[in-house]
C-alpha cells in the first residue's frame, strides 16, 4: 500500500491506490547538493541529470574501500524522495545533483558553497522555472554559508535543508540557521520527534516546520530497483522540496515568502508531542508538519501570517532581542516574552528602512525573546503610532488616526524595572477596537496598516482567576495579526502567537496568589483582506 | 532565523597598522573578523574563506588574493587560491598557514575570514 | 484503472513466428517497464524480457534472445512480443506485467496461450 | 544468474494453520525480492513487494520477511481461498528470476 510518509502529506481527496496528485511538480527543478547518485535507478532513470560538479574532500582513513553503492546510498535515496516514480513526492519533477559530500557522506562548507555558486551559474545562463535547492547536509554555524544561502535565496531560489540530527538547536548549525533557508525537523508515523540513536531531530526556533523523516522508504543504490527504508532530516527536508515543486507547479509565481507561508498554512498543527523537546525550547518549536495544500488552485485570497522568534537576548540589563520579518512580509505585531517574567516590554522600530520587533530584558531577568508577526500583505502601507506614558490612572492609550488604517498589533515597552501588580487593571472601554491600551507607566505602540480591502477586528478572553496560560483565536476565514495581553503587569511572562491563536502566559499560579490582580487578558487582533478573496474570485 | 551575531564562535583582530604599505588601504575603522566552527572536531584548519565586502568586482577579489599570495611569500609562507568566488559572493578560498590570517584580515575589501569546515549529510 | 489487454490464444505452426500483443491503459504507458513472462503448463514462472516503452530499451534472459523479439509502439500503447522459430517447447501461457520500481509486478495481463501445432 | 530456491514444491496446511515459505537466493540480493500468488487458471497477483511490504488491498494475514539471501512468506491464519501457487522473485539484477513455486493444498 501508499507508503505511510506518502500518505501522512496527502490531503485526502487524493489518497488512491496510485498517490498522483495532479501536476507533479513538472516545471520545477529541484537541485539536490548530496553524494553521487545512481541515475539509472529505475524508481529516479529520466528524471535526474548528474551535473559535472564534484568537490569533495578525501575519505578518511586508509583502509578505506570506495564502493559505488554505498557511495551513492543517501543521495540515490533523496533523489528518490523528491521525485521517485513510486515513493516520490513530486513524479513529475525533474532533478540536478551535484557531489558535495563523500563516500562517507561529508563534504565541507567551501565545497558547499562553491555547489550553490554553480547553481547561481546555471541559472544566470539558462534561465528556467522555479529553482529548488535541497541541502541535506549540515555543519556547525557558518556566516559564510548562510550568507551565501541568503544571496540565492533574494536571487529568486528557494532553499530546503535538514535540520540536523544532532538533538539540538538548529541554530548551532548550518545551513539550518539560515533565515532564508527553509529548515525541516523530521517526524515518525505517529507524527512524534525523530529519534535516531542517542540522538534525533534538532529543533528549535530555526526549524520552520516538520515533515516525515523515519522508515522513509526509498531507491536504494544496491541495484537498479532497489528500495530501503533511511530515516534522518535530510529525508524530511527532501519530502518539503518535493512539496516545494508541486507548489511551485501550480504557482510558478510564488516568492519565498509566499511558499514558506502556504507550507506553514497547510501543515497539519499540533500533532507533535513537545515533551520529546527540552522545555526550553518547546515553545520556540514550530509545532508543524508538512503537507501538499488540498488543491493545485492558489489560496491567494488568503491573509497568511507566521510567527518570528528572535534568538535569546541574554541575561544582562540593557540586553534585547530583534526578530524581524523576511524582505516580501509585513511587520504587523511586536510581542515579548520572558521565562523569568522580568522583561521591559517590546517596541517596532525601523531598521534599515524595514520595521523590525525589539524586546527588552530587565534588571534581574534572565533574558528575553522578541516575537513578531509576519504577514503577507500586498500593497500595505504600515507604520507605528507611540503614546508616552500616560502617568494618568486611565492608563496609556494611542489609536490609529489616519484615514483608512486599521490598528494590526499592540506593543509595550516600559523603561521602570517593576510596573507593579498593584495598579488596578485596565480595561478597554467598549467600542473602541481601533486603539491600544496600557499601564500607565509604559508607552505604548499601535502598528496601523492600510492595505486594500484589509479589516479587522479585536477579540478578548479574560480570566479573572489566575491561569498559567490564556488563549483567544481567531475564528475561521479570519488571521491572527496581533497578540497581547491586558493589563500589561509584570506577572505577565509575555504573549506570542501560536498558528491561529493568542496564547498569554502568566508565571505560576502558586506565586502569584489567587487576588484580583491574578486577572489576565489576552487580546487578539484578528484580520482578514476582502481585496485578496475578490481578486480570487475574478480568478476563478 | 539567526542573525548574524549569532551562536558561534568569532576571533576579532583589529587592524592596528598600514604595514606592507598597502595601496588600498582599508577603511578608517573597520574590522575585519574571524569566524570558525565552534565544534572543534569539525574544524578544517589551513583552508579559508576570505570574504570581500559586497560590492568587490571579480577583478579586485583576484587582485586581493594575489595580494595575500604576493605577501604572504615575503614572510617564507606558501599559500594556494583554490577558488576566486563571484556570482553569489565576492573573496577566494585560500589554503594557508593559520599564522597568516592577521595579514590577511588587513587586505582591502575584506569583510571576514571563516575557517573551512566539514558538513555531513543528515 | 489499470488493464493489460492480451488475446486468449494462437495456434501456430512449427517454424512460424507469432507476435504477441498487451495494450495498456488506465496509466502512463511510458512511465513503466513491461515484461513478459512464460509459463509452460504445470510448470512455473519463467522471465523472458523486459522492455521500456519510453525508449525501446531492452534486457533479455540469455535462454530467450534468438527467440523473443520485444518492441512496443507508444501511439497505441501497446507492447509486442515477437516470438520467432517456434516448437512445442514454445506452447505456454505467455503474460505482460507491468514493473513499477517499487511495486514490482503489480499488474499482469490475463495471457495468451500460444500452441504450436502442425 | 540469480537461483531462487523454493524448498518445499507442496505445503499441506488445515484452515487457520500458520504457514510460511522459505525461499533461498543463490547470491545477496539485499530486499529486492517480490512474492506472487497464482490461483488456478489465473494471472499471478502481486502480494509482497521489497521483501516486507505488503501490497495494496492484500489481507494483513500475508507477510513477508529477510534479507540477504534467506527470506520468508507467510500466512498467519490460512483460508480456503489461499489454495494457489506462491513464487518469490527476486528483482536485483537481470535476468529476473522466480522460485520454482511452492503449492498450498488445504486438507
Known amino acids: 500500500s501508499i507508503p505511510w510518509n506518502l500518505e501522512r502529506i496527502t490531503p485526502p481527496r487524493y489518497r488512491a491506490d496510485e498517490y498522483q496528485p495532479p501536476d507533479g511538480g513538472s516545471l520545477v527543478e529541484v537541485y539536490l547538493l548530496d553524494t553521487s547518485i545512481q541515475s539509472d535507478h529505475r524508481e529516479i532513470e529520466g528524471r535526474v541529470m548528474v551535473t559535472d560538479f564534484e568537490n569533495v574532500p578525501e575519505e578518511d582513513g586508509t583502509r578505506f574501500h570506495r564502493q559505488a553503492s554505498k557511495c551513492d546510498s543517501h543521495g540515490t535515496h533523496l533523489a528518490g524522495v523528491v521525485s521517485g516514480r513510486d515513493a516520490g513526492v513530486a513524479k513529475g519533477a525533474s532533478m540536478r545533483s551535484l557531489r558535495v559530500l563523500n563516500c562517507q557522506g561529508k563534504g565541507t562548507v567551501s565545497g558547499t558553497l562553491i555547489g550553490l555558486e554553480f547553481i547561481r551559474k546555471s541559472q544566470l545562463v539558462q534561465p528556467v522555472g522555479p529553482l529548488v535547492v535541497l541541502l541535506p547536509l549540515a555543519g556547525g554555524y557558518s556566516r559564510v554559508l548562510n550568507a551565501a544561502c541568503q544571496r540565492l535565496a533574494r536571487a529568486g531560489v528557494v532553499l530546503v535543508t535538514a535540520a540536523g540530527n544532532f538533538r539540538d538547536d538548529a541554530c548551532l548549525y548550518s545551513p539550518a540557521s539560515a533565515p532564508e533557508v527553509i529548515t525541516v525537523g523530521a517526524t515518525n508515523a505517529q507524527d512524534q520527534p525523530v529519534t535516531l540513536g542517542t540522538l534525533g531531530t534538532n529543533f528549535g526556533r530555526c526549524v520552520d516546520l516538520f515533515a516525515p523523516g523515519e522508515d522513509i522508504i526509498g531507491a536504494s543504490s544496491d541495484c537498479s530497483t532497489c528500495f530501503v527504508s533511511q530515516s534522518g532530516t535530510s529525508q524530511a527536508a527532501a519530502h518539503v522540496a518535493g512539496i516545494a515543486a508541486m507548489m511551485l507547479s501550480a504557482e510558478p509565481e510564488l516568492t519565498l515568502a509566499e511558499l514558506r507561508q502556504r507550507l506553514i498554512h497547510f501543515s497539519a498543527k499540533d500533532v507533535i508531542n513537545e515533551a520529546w523537546f527540552p522545555e526550553d525550547q518547546r515553545v520556540l518549536t514550530p509545532n508543524l508538519v508538512a503537507a501538499l495544500p488540498p488543491s493545485t488552485h492558489g489560496a491567494g485570497w488568503q491573509l497568511f501570517c507566521r510567527t518570528v522568534w528572535s534568538a535569546h537576548s541574554g541575561p544582562t540589563r540593557m540586553a534585547t532581542a530583534v526578530a524581524r520579518c523576511a524582505p516580501d512580509e509585513e511587520l504587523l505585531s511586536c510581542s515579548s516574552f520572558s521565562r523569568s517574567g522580568k522583561r521591559r516590554g517590546e517596541r517596532m522600530e525601523a531598521q534599515g528602512g524595514k520595521l523590525v520587533c525589539r524586546a527588552h530584558n530587565a534588571f534581574g531577568g534572565e533574558g528575553v525573546y522578541a516575537i513578531a508577526r509576519c504577514c503577507l500583505l500586498p500593497q500595505a502601507n504600515c507604520s507605528v503610532h507611540t503614546a508616552p506614558p500616560a502617568e494618568a490612572s486611565m492608563g496609556t492609550r494611542v489609536h490609529c488616526h489616519q484615514q483608512g488604517h486599521v490598528l494590526t498589533g499592540c506593543s509595550s515597552h516600559w523603561e521602570v524595572e517593576d510596573l507593579g501588580t498593584h495598579k488596578p487593571p485596565v480595561l478597554r472601554p467598549r467600542g473602541q477596537p481601533n486603539q491600544c491600551v496600557g499601564h500607565r507607566e509604559a508607552s505604548i505602540h499601535a502598528s496601523c496598516c492600510h492595505a486594500p480591502g484589509l479589516e479587522c477586528k479585536v477579540k478578548e478572553h479574560g480570566i479573572p482567576a489566575p491561569q498559567e496560560q490564556v488563549t483567544v483565536a481567531c475564528e475561521e476565514g479570519w488571521t491572527l495579526t496581533g497578540c497581547s495581553a491586558l493589563p500589561g503587569t509584570s506577572h505577565v511572562l509575555g504573549a506570542y502567537a501560536v498558528d491561529n491563536t493568542c496564547v498569554v502566559r502568566s508565571r505560576d499560579v502558586s506565586t502569584t496568589g489567587s487576588t484580583s490582580e491574578g486577572a489576565v487578558t489576552a487580546v487578539a487582533i484578528c484580520c482578514r483582506s476582502r481585496h485578496l478573496a475578490q481578486a480570487s474570485q475574478e480568478l476563478q | 532565523q539567526e542573525d548574524e551575531d549569532g551562536d558561534y564562535e568569532e576571533l576579532v583582530l583589529a587592524l592596528r597598522s598600514e604595514e606592507d604599505g598597502l595601496a588600498e588601504a582599508p577603511e578608517h575603522g573597520t574590522t575585519a573578523t574571524f569566524h570558525r566552527c565552534a565544534k572543534d572536531p569539525w574544524r578544517l584548519p589551513g583552508t579559508y574563506v576570505v570574504v570581500l565586502k559586497e560590492e568587490t568586482h571579480l577583478s579586485q577579489s583576484e587582485r586581493t588574493a594575489r595580494r595575500l599570495q604576493a605577501q604572504a611569500a615575503r614572510r617564507g609562507y606558501l599559500t594556494k587560491i583554490l577558488h576566486v568566488f563571484h556570482g553569489l559572493l565576492p573573496g577566494f578560498l585560500v589554503k594557508m598557514s593559520g599564522d597568516l590570517l592577521e595579514l590577511a584580515l588587513k587586505l582591502p575589501h575584506v569583510d571576514y575570514i571563516e575557517e573551512d569546515s566539514s558538513v555531513f549529510a543528515q | 484503472q489499470v488493464q493489460l489487454q492480451q488475446p486468449g490464444a494462437e495456434l501456430v505452426k512449427p517454424g512460424a513466428s507469432v507476435k504477441l500483443s498487451c495494450k495498456a491503459s488506465g496509466y502512463t504507458f511510458t512511465s513503466y517497464w513491461m515484461h513478459w513472462v512464460k509459463q509452460r503448463p504445470g510448470q512455473g514462472l519463467e522471465w523472458i524480457g523486459e522492455?521500456?516503452?519510453?525508449?525501446?530499451?531492452?534486457n533479455y534472459n540469455e535462454k530467450f534472445k534468438s527467440k523473443a523479439t520485444l518492441t512496443v509502439d507508444k501511439s497505441s500503447s501497446t507492447a509486442y512480443m515477437q516470438l520467432s522459430s517456434l516448437t512445442s517447447e514454445d506452447s505456454a501461457v505467455y503474460y505482460c506485467a507491468r514493473e513499477r520500481p517499487l511495486y514490482a509486478m503489480d499488474y499482469w495481463g490475463q495471457g495468451t496461450s500460444v500452441t504450436v501445432s502442425s | 544468474d540469480i537461483v531462487m530456491t523454493q524448498s518445499h514444491k507442496f505445503m499441506s496446511t488445515s484452515v487457520g494453520d500458520r504457514v510460511s515459505i522459505t525461499c533461498k537466493a543463490s547470491q545477496d540480493v539485499s530486499t529486492a525480492v517480490a512474492w506472487y500468488q497464482q490461483k488456478p487458471g489465473q494471472s499471478p497477483k502481486l502480494l509482497i513487494y521489497s521483501a516486507s511490504y505488503r501490497y495494496t488491498g492484500v489481507p494483513d494475514r500475508f507477510t513477508g520477511s529477510g534479507s540477504g539471501t534467506d527470506f520468508t512468506f507467510t500466512i498467519s491464519s490460512v483460508q480456503a481461498e489461499d489454495l494457489a501457487v506462491y513464487y518469490c522473485?527476486?528483482?536485483?539484477?537481470?535476468?529476473?528470476?522466480f522460485g520454482g513455486g511452492t503449492k498450498l493444498e488445504i486438507k
Open positions: 522492455i521500456n516503452p519510453s525508449n525501446g530499451r531492452t
Open positions: 522473485q527476486q528483482r536485483y539484477s537481470t535476468p529476473r528470476t
